[in-house]
């Protein structure tokens, strides 16, 4: 051994005076002379290029050129390689350590608040985590020991900049302004792209990113790359930030972050970001299912392991709250799956943002920006081919769950593209093949990862999917600071935490309700309505008397038809009253002269055959509502394509007479005739199917007014369409929220545990062109159309100013989980 040592460069690297066995040398020139000792390459050269220790390096003489040190004094000097303790001192590595040793929070002296590390791996789709888990031991360990979701939903469009900035602001792209990687703002008259300096203009970046939220509340923040971190947002940069340079090795990024954690307490940040370009780069180049992606996953896993090992070396591995996530997923694209605009237009006289989430605007901007006829473009792209692989939308008509409309940068024409397809201008575009993203955020291929570990997080837990707008509030809770206003629902991720910091409570009702009292069984004004079936005033009196419920009957109908409580009204100054019926309850909005909501429970019926037809041509005044607050039947005669629909379907009756409880003006809402076809099919066929499958469903439905398409209920003066020129407004959408018991052995009104929700927000349009229904029966298109417009209960709440489930005996944070849940039916990736 002694002889071997004498022939070794160990501790002798670049020492010009050293002469080893057989006169071997370890100086800089030995390679030129050819007299290097046997281990010169491994011990001296390789050591300056690697970020790890090994048996050659342990105890090495400090090398100026090395990236990190394995010398005996490196711990004091704070420049050890991340794995020094495990390789050179025989400690158990983080990877080998048992999860169970991480039971209690272990923060060293000076770490009063557990630091938060937000780590993004671009384009890491959720499926990779399950398919390639054995190739990613470090990430897999984090998944096993910490908490993870089945997936995290990206926001639309599922692109890098919009989603990274959403994660750190809690805002939808329409709210924070970064609506795509490429965009035009007519007010700035500038173009934003990832390749131009313009991206660093603060005018593009709205909202308050996490680093500023932390800094405004006395904490320091450090970003090792993150979209927006090099921009003087609101005039400020993060406390520490790095100018973006994609060629910085991942190990160098990790090493720098670890050095920031070594800073003295007064200088040390509490919040950190880390960004890796992989596996996105490889996914684009070769597609998601490729050797290149597998290699990239191994690379990022190794670098992540270096971080965890470095944390362990500092005894921070059970002190730091680390969140590992992605911005979006990845899908395969093909050069034979291209939609060309030249197939739809004789000439392309518009500008198109091409790809998986295309937008179309005027070519000549700013001059033609506002006068560009978007409606005409959408018309020319609608229902043109039987196998069309995109659906054109005016952005206000996009599914509301996307929240992708209210920003001047979001061009009015939008193409919703099928998975794996691309929509481009012409065949001159050959940017296809490999992988891409940007598609519908419900596609499984677009799902992103979310894993977390640390003293604040629960351990060994898998949670249901959630949306990335919720992460900002979560990080604020981890840092015990107040979030800026955002689109997340604070408290909805409390189930990820051992001890939640924020305790949510139900919203206070803003507008009190009254009860529309029953005074007289005969109306003072028949509102131009007719019901030939009620041939005299005695019959009319009889059916109207049915609307006069006793207190016992009110209690009974509330128990069955409002099992989770009455929706609370959070809009200001809304004069509303409750209307009780044996089979439904509704909240009547006096200013709008229509029900704001109607609630009823459909039991599990014996058979699933469609409902019988409603009594035809029979409508009458509701004697509980003054004529001045009611619609009139005559309103509907003047507007040919507007008819009336019923919120509570009269055909769902339990007795032959009870149908008359629904054939009243207070149950009426204006509907386009084409829309009503879908509405009626839903209630007579699909609703019965749902009730049968779920052991009964509670239904709450009602109108929505969002003419300014901002995702929030409109002020009355913002409403632009009215029936027959009266002040009866025409809704922009209708909502339907189906609620059943998760445990299907219970009915909705006797549900002890979790609820299941299926909310729809259906655009109310004069035609069904969105479904290209020509010559097709409703069975072929209605369900597909409704599924496209599934939303969260929270989306319904924002659009209506109502608040649901307040009387459900369940912790509020669990109710918020329910409200932020988005049902999905995507099965294939």
């Amino acid at each position: 051994r002694k002889l071997e040592k004498q022939g070794s460069c160990r501790k002798k690297c670049f020492d010009a005076s050293f002469r080893g066995l057989e006169n071997c040398r370890c100086d800089v020139a030995c390679e030129d002379r050819g007299d290097c000792c046997w281990d010169f390459e491994d011990t001296c050269v390789e050591s300056t290029r690697i970020w790890t220790c090994n048996k050659f390096r342990c105890g090495e003489t400090r090398l100026e050129a090395s990236l990190c040190s394995c010398s005996d004094d490196c711990l004091q000097r704070k420049d050890c390689c991340a794995d020094y303790k495990s390789v050179c001192q025989g400690e158990t590595s983080w990877l080998e350590e048992n999860c169970d040793t991480a039971q209690q929070s272990q923060c060293p002296e000076g770490f009063d608040l557990p630091p938060v590390i937000l780590f993004s791996m671009d384009g890491f789709r959720a499926e990779y985590l399950y398919t390639w888990d054995t190739l990613m031991p470090n990430i897999n360990k984090l998944k096993t020991c910490g908490i993870h979701s089945k997936y995290m939903r990206a926001m639309y469009p599922t692109k890098t900049f919009p989603n990274h900035y959403t994660i750190v602001t809690g805002l939808y792209p329409e709210s924070h302004g970064i609506i795509d990687n490429n965009m035009y703002d007519v007010n700035l008259n500038k173009n934003f792209s990832l390749s131009s300096e313009e991206q660093n203009n603060p005018a593009w970046w709205h909202g308050q990113p996490m680093w500023l939220t932390a800094m405004y509340q006395g904490l320091k923040a450090a970003t090792y790359f993150w979209p927006g971190s090099e921009v003087a947002i609101n005039g400020s940069f993060p406390s520490i930030y790095m100018p973006y340079n994609r060629s910085v090795p991942y190990e160098e990024r990790i090493s720098t972050l670890l050095k920031w954690l070594d800073l003295p307490k007064a200088e040390r940040p509490s919040f950190y970001t880390m960004y890796f370009e992989e596996p996105d780069s490889s996914g684009h180049a070769s597609g998601p299912v490729s050797a290149r992606v597998i290699k990239a996953l191994q690379v990022v896993d190794h670098a992540f392991g270096m971080l965890m090992e470095g944390l362990k070396q500092r005894n921070l591995h059970n002190c730091v709250n680390i969140i590992l996530l992605a911005d979006h997923g990845m899908d395969q694209t093909y050069c034979n799956k291209m939609e060309y605009m030249t197939d739809y237009f004789p000439r392309i006289n518009f500008y198109m943002y091409e790809g998986p989430a295309p937008r179309i605007r005027a070519l000549n901007v700013p001059h033609d920006f506002f006068s560009f006829n978007s409606e005409e473009i959408v018309r020319n792209l609608s229902c043109r081919k039987p196998d069309q692989h995109f659906k054109p939308y005016l952005t206000p008509d996009l599914p509301k769950r996307l929240h992708y409309a209210k920003n001047v940068r979001i061009d009015k024409v939008h193409l919703f593209v099928d998975p794996q397809w691309l929509a481009v201008g012409s065949k001159s575009n050959t940017n296809c093949g490999g992988g891409n993203h940007g598609y519908n955020n419900e596609f499984r291929s677009m799902e992103a990862i979310f894993l977390a570990h640390g003293p604040s997080f629960k351990e060994k837990t898998e949670v249901e999917p959630f949306e990335n707008i919720e992460v900002y509030n979560l990080m604020c809770d981890l840092l015990r600071i107040q979030p800026a206003p955002n689109n997340g629902t604070r408290g909805s991720l409390n189930h990820l935490l051992k001890v939640p910091f924020y305790k949510p409570s139900h919203a206070e009702e803003v507008s009190k309700f009254s009860v529309c009292g029953f005074a007289n069984p005969l109306p003072t004004d028949n509102l131009s309505c007719l019901c030939p079936h009620l041939q005299n005033s005695i019959q009319l009196e009889q059916v109207n008397q049915m609307l006069n419920l006793t207190q016992e009957e009110i209690t009974a109908t509330v128990k069955v038809n409002l099992p989770f409580g009455r929706p609370r009204v959070l809009q200001k100054n809304v004069d509303n009253c409750l209307l009780y019926h044996r089979e439904y309850v509704s909240g009547f909005g006096k200013a709008m002269r229509m029900p704001m909501w109607s609630s009823y429970t459909v039991p599990q019926l014996g058979d699933t055959s469609p409902l019988p037809p409603t009594v035809p041509d029979c409508l009458r005044a509701d004697v509980r509502v003054p004529p001045s607050e009611s619609q009139k039947c005559s309103f509907y005669l003047a507007d040919e394509n507007i008819t009336h629909g019923f919120l509570y379907p009269p055909a769902i009756n339990r007795t032959s007479d009870s149908q008359y409880d629904a054939l009243i003006m207070s149950n009426l809402v204006p509907m386009y005739e084409e829309f009503r076809k879908m509405w009626d099919y839903f209630h007579s066929v699909l609703l019965i199917k749902h009730a049968t499958e779920r052991n009964g469903v509670n239904v709450v439905s009602g109108p929505i007014f969002d003419y300014n398409y901002d995702g929030h209920f409109d002020a009355p003066e913002e409403i632009t369409k009215h029936i027959a020129n009266t002040d009866i407004p025409i809704p922009t959408h209708y909502f339907v929220v189906l609620t059943s018991c998760k445990n299907k052995s219970h009915t909705p009104e006797n549900c002890p545990g979790w609820l299941d929700v299926l909310p729809f927000i259906i655009p109310h349009r004069p035609t069904n062109v969105e479904s290209c229904p020509e010559g097709k029966p409703e069975a072929l298109w209605v369900e597909e159309r409704l599924t496209a417009h599934i939303a969260r209960v929270r989306d319904v709440e924002l659009l209506t100013g109502l608040d649901f489930y307040q009387d459900k005996a369940q912790p509020v944070s669990e109710i918020l989980q329910l409200k932020t849940y988005l049902p999905t039916f995507e099965t294939t990736i």
């Epitope: 978007s374 020129n725 002040d727």
Partner: antibody, heavy 115, light 107 residues
């Protein structure tokens, strides 16, 4: 038959005030939002103000904001426009019109502003 | 505010001929557009609302089309009583705005 009859026009000095009225009949007044539109001599139409059926909102053109006040009395089927601080450029025929698109108009009342 | 631009300012047409009037909005007004006819000394009269729906009592020779930013009023065969000034107006946004008018005169 729907009828709208304006009154209250006349000659007034700059800085003066006038109150216009519009009497409605032949329809349920409380079902409709109402509007004032004016037309200067030899010029086109200019929207002045709108009020919703139950007065939950009133909207004004920038040119009259802070000077004109629109109101209604549903019990009396009446619409009003209180015009203060009148200017030369306010001289016009003032029409009241029904609904969100103006399906019925009155015959108009002339407001003359001159010193 | 949304600027409504009508063209032409004056249209000279012979009785029995077709007249096509254009109205352009500076930004989309969806289909919330109305057309009015005004004869000298009289109040305007509603012809078309919702861009294409004829108002009560309006003859079938009047038709409206368009949506978004481009709209057209067509009078298929001009009668003597149709010579007047025609205004378009949007009711999609506040403030409500009118076009400057197109005068249809006898050729």
């Amino acid at each position: 038959e729907v009828q709208l009859v304006e009154s209250g026009g006349g000659r007034v000095k700059p800085g003066g005030s006038l109150r216009l009225s519009c009497a409605a009949s032949g329809f349920t007044f409380s079902d409709y939002s109402m509007n004032w539109v004016r037309q200067a001599p030899g010029k086109g139409l200019e929207w002045v103000s709108s009020i919703s059926s139950i007065s939950s909102y009133v909207k004004y053109a920038d040119s009259v904001k802070g000077r004109f006040t629109m109101s209604r009395d549903n019990a009396k089927n009446s619409l009003f426009l209180q015009m203060n601080s009148l200017r030369d450029e306010d001289m016009a025929v003032y029409y009241c019109a029904r609904g969100h698109y103006f399906d019925y108009w009155g015959q108009g009342t002339l407001v003359t502003v001159s010193s | 505010e949304i600027v409504m631009t009508q063209s032409p300012a004056t249209l000279s047409v012979s009785p029995g001929e077709r007249a096509t009037l254009s109205c352009r909005a500076s930004q989309s007004v969806s289909s919330n557009l109305a057309w009015y006819q005004q004869k000298p000394g009289l109040a305007p009269r509603l012809l078309i609302y919702g861009a294409s729906t004829r108002a009560t009592g309006i003859p079938a020779r009047f038709s409206g089309s368009g949506s978004g930013t481009e709209f057209t009023l067509t009078i298929s065969s001009l009668q003597s009583e149709d010579f007047a000034v025609y205004y378009c107006q949007q009711y999609n946004n506040w403030p409500r705005t009118f076009g400057q008018g197109t005068k249809v005169e006898i050729k």
